[in-house]
Amino acid sequence: CDLPQTHSLGNRRALILLAQMGRISHFSCLKDRHDFGFPEEEFDGHQFQKAQAISVLHEMIQQTFNLFSTEDSSAAWEQSLLEKFSTELYQQLNDLEACVIQEVGVEETPLMNEDSILAVRKYFQRITLYLTEKKYSPCAWEVVRAEIMRSLSFSTNLQKRLRRKD
């Protein structure tokens, strides 16, 4: 399965939108930095069959979409930017879903690498717990925004490596 060129453009657009979503000076939020334990090893792309890598990417985008679709998120961010960001993520999910179906047929592998998917879910649980503990403060959201930008960058790099394998 070849992810369409529009997919990588959408990825870039999502990152740009996320960068634009900042509402407060992040310099006031240093003390709120937190170790979310991003599962970096799940995104190095070496140990995966392509179907598994795509499943992990799908989970990453799905969880990001869920995080930014909550009521608390709507209260934190500028609505039009949030809607555009969600639209980009939704389009990426569609692209990845089509690919997952295609790749599973070709490789005859299980739909997901369960451990990897679980690692991504637990990562987002830690993010949600952090936001709850910080009472969804503006700084907490800034820290999460920075973290998601970083994790989406890892996702983008994994997609580039997958394209090079084709």
Epitope: A19, F27, R33
Partner: antibody, heavy 121, light 107 residues
Framework: EVQLVQSGAEVKKPGESLKISCKGS????????IGWVRQMPGKGLEWMGI????????AYSPSFQGQVTISADKSISTAYLQWSSLKASDTAMYYC??????????????WGQGTLVTVSS | DIQMTQSPSSLSASVGDRVTITCRAS??????LNWYQQKPGKAPKLLIY???SLQSGVPSRFSGSGSGTDFTLTISSLQPEDFATYYC?????????FGQGTKVEIK
């Protein structure tokens, strides 16, 4: 390979202006902040200020606020430190260093080689 | 501003010695504390971040500990290339501040 390359040594007279640079390569320039640190001859390290190149937001140490200006041009992955009117007491080595921003990652993990600024009449 | 105070300001030691440098913050900084090494004419080099995490490529003889206001940098067995000046730095709030430095010299 991550690199921060600073502009060369400068010799200036009191009252003159100066702009020194720090060019980042080998990483996404807008994903990290760039900080500036002063080291006067034989002395310790003093943090001057920082910039987020993604939006050019800045923060300064109170000791340097109004004395210097930090800026960046993300299109050429370069940060700047400038003075409008130098004093003899500005004579020092100036370092730039990258900072991970709000991410949980090492602070100031890469440094420029330093720019020696000498101000003398 | 958060003041960072290092002790001692200088020390003499021999190759193979265990060396300990302390850093005290004027208020709690949790674990937002970094250690740097600087050799004459060179830029500082990050050794330890978040109080106890060893920076990639730094020898394991360097270790950091502490939280709140009191922190320690330990060199378990001093090597010839370790003679340098060491700085602590808090990274919990602006303005970021450094300790005054500890110079480690050959005995």
């Amino acid at each position: 390979e991550v690199q921060l390359v600073q502009s060369g040594a400068e010799v200036k007279k009191p009252g003159e202006s100066l702009k020194i640079s720090c060019k980042g390569s080998g990483y996404s320039f807008t994903s990290y902040w760039i900080g500036w640190v002063r080291q006067m001859p034989g002395k310790g390290l003093e943090w001057m200020g920082i910039i987020d190149p993604s939006d050019s937001d800045t923060a300064y140490s109170p000791s340097f606020q109004g004395q210097v200006t930090i800026s960046a041009d993300k299109s050429i992955s370069t940060a700047y430190l400038q003075w409008s009117s130098l004093k003899a007491s500005d004579t020092a080595m100036y370092y730039c260093a990258r900072h991970p921003g709000l991410n949980w990652a090492p602070d100031f993990d890469y440094w420029g080689q330093g720019t020696l600024v000498t101000v003398s009449s | 501003d958060i003041q960072m105070t290092q002790s001692p300001s200088s020390l003499s030691a021999s190759v193979g010695d265990r060396v300990t440098i302390t850093c005290r913050a004027s208020q709690s900084i949790a674990e937002f504390l970094n250690w740097y090494q600087q050799k004459p004419g060179k830029a500082p080099k990050l050794l330890i971040y978040f109080a106890s995490s060893l920076q990639s490529g730094v020898p394991s003889r360097f270790s950091g500990s502490g939280s709140g206001t009191d922190f320690t940098l330990t060199i378990s067995s001093l090597q010839p290339e370790d003679f340098a000046t060491y700085y602590c730095q808090q990274s919990i709030d602006f303005p970021l501040t450094f300790g005054q430095g500890t110079k480690v010299e050959i005995k």
